[in-house]
């Protein structure tokens, strides 16, 4: 059973992940970002279901493609290089989902834009945080 300290740790990690995803979204949606049109042409894959921490496997599997698209954006739109940003996210995701459980991600048939993809995972973080508080 999760202890209050482990719940607190999970909540902090989710809040960190949420902030990172929001930072990326803000950088992309920045009105000065001339790359938005180009970035929106790239397809991302969404989970059929995302209600538990194990479903973060679906986010982990899309982090490399996310990094590739972020590489298109002007570096000044973000505080960190895409590689460092994604690396930070990856560390949090691995800790949150746990490495001992092997979960096969199931993807939805429809693809999403980078904005829809980020919004979906932001909503996921917010929803899990709300169940923990």
């Amino acid at each position: 059973a999760p202890t209050s300290s482990s719940t607190k740790k999970t909540q902090l990690q989710l809040e960190h992940l949420l902030l990172d995803l929001q930072m990326i979204l803000n950088g992309i949606n920045n009105y000065k970002n001339p790359k938005l049109t180009r970035m929106l042409t790239f397809k991302f894959y969404m989970p059929k279901k995302a209600t538990e921490l194990k479903h973060l496997q679906c986010l982990e599997e899309e982090l490399k493609p996310l990094e590739e698209v972020l590489n298109l954006a002007q570096s000044k739109n973000f505080h960190l290089r895409p590689r460092d940003l994604i690396s930070n996210i990856n560390v949090i995701v691995l800790e949150l989902k746990g490495s001992e459980t092997t979960f096969m991600c199931e993807y939805a048939d429809e693809t999403a834009t980078i904005v829809e993809f980020l919004n979906r995972w932001i909503t996921f973080c917010q929803s899990i945080i709300s169940t923990l508080t």
Epitope: P34, K35, R38, T41, F42, K43, F44, Y45, E61, E62, K64, P65, E67, E68, N71, L72, Q74, C105, Y107
Partner: antibody
Framework: EIQLQQSGPELRRPGSSVKLSCKAS????????IHWVRHRPEHGLEWIGW????????RYAQKFQSKATLTADTSSNAAYMQLSSLTPEDTATYFC??????????????WGQGTLVTVSS | DIVMTQSPFSLAVSEGEMVTINCKSS????????????LAWYQQKPGQSPKLLIY???TGQSGVPDRFIGSGSGTDFTLTISDVQAEDLADYYC?????????FGAGTKLELK
């Protein structure tokens, strides 16, 4: 028809620099990234970097960061690569290339014919 | 960077033979979301620019003869040329574009016996 036309062969002295051109036709250069690739027979193919002609944003492979400078001129629908502080190791054929369409960054589907750069004293 | 290990370095063949060229990546090139491997194969003849043969590991580029077949997934990939023709004598390279920077294999030279 999409075509990339590159400038002719160049002979340079060590320590000098050279600027190669890649003129696009059959599409608007701002529609896609332009990549540059080096070919040396004994080393194979190496990716140098890309430029987004739309805003001049560039990315380089680490080893070419201080060697190559990529630019583009949308009015002439062309991309350029300047190579500086040339050494005999820079003797190679340099290609410009672009991907299948604008929804791809890679792979390289359309290539220029290549420009041979020879560095010799 | 992802390292692409290509083998063999060279290959001497007779016309009509079948050949296989292998490429191994230092990490998986499979994107789970679309089940596509971000690997391409190129042919380069002397004095010419590389020509895209196969992308996504197994999709033939338009106009490429169907004797060129790409297969494999994850970290192990193969380019098979069935019924080799004299015009197929060239250098062949694999390219991974799953992660920046894109990296090529060292190449395989296909020569006539």
């Amino acid at each position: 028809e999409i075509q990339l036309q590159q400038s002719g062969p160049e002979l340079r002295r060590p320590g000098s620099s050279v600027k190669l051109s890649c003129k696009a036709s059959g599409y608007n250069i701002t529609d896609n990234l332009i990549h540059w690739v080096r070919h040396r027979p004994e080393h194979g193919l190496e990716w140098i970097g890309w430029i987004d002609p739309e805003d001049g944003e560039t990315r380089y492979a680490q080893k070419f960061q201080s060697k190559a400078t990529l630019t583009a001129d949308t009015s002439s629908n062309a991309a350029y690569m300047q190579l500086s502080s040339l050494t005999p190791e820079d003797t190679a054929t340099y290609f410009c290339a672009r991907s299948l369409d604008s929804t791809y960054i890679y792979p390289f589907a359309y290539w220029g014919q290549g420009t041979l750069v020879t560095v010799s004293s | 960077d992802i390292v692409m290990t290509q083998s063999p370095f060279s290959l001497a063949v007779s016309e009509g033979e079948m050949v296989t060229i292998n490429c191994k990546s230092s990490q998986s090139l499979l994107r789970s979301g679309n089940q596509k491997n971000y690997l391409a194969w190129y042919q380069q003849k002397p004095g010419q620019s590389p020509k895209l043969l196969i992308y996504y590991a197994s999709t033939g580029q338009s106009g490429v003869p169907d004797r060129f077949i790409g297969s494999g997934s994850g970290t192990d990939f193969t380019l098979t040329i069935s019924d080799v023709q004299a015009e197929d004598l060239a250098d062949y390279y694999c390219l991974q574009h799953y992660q920046s920077p894109p990296t090529f294999g060292a190449g395989t030279k296909l020569e006539l016996k």
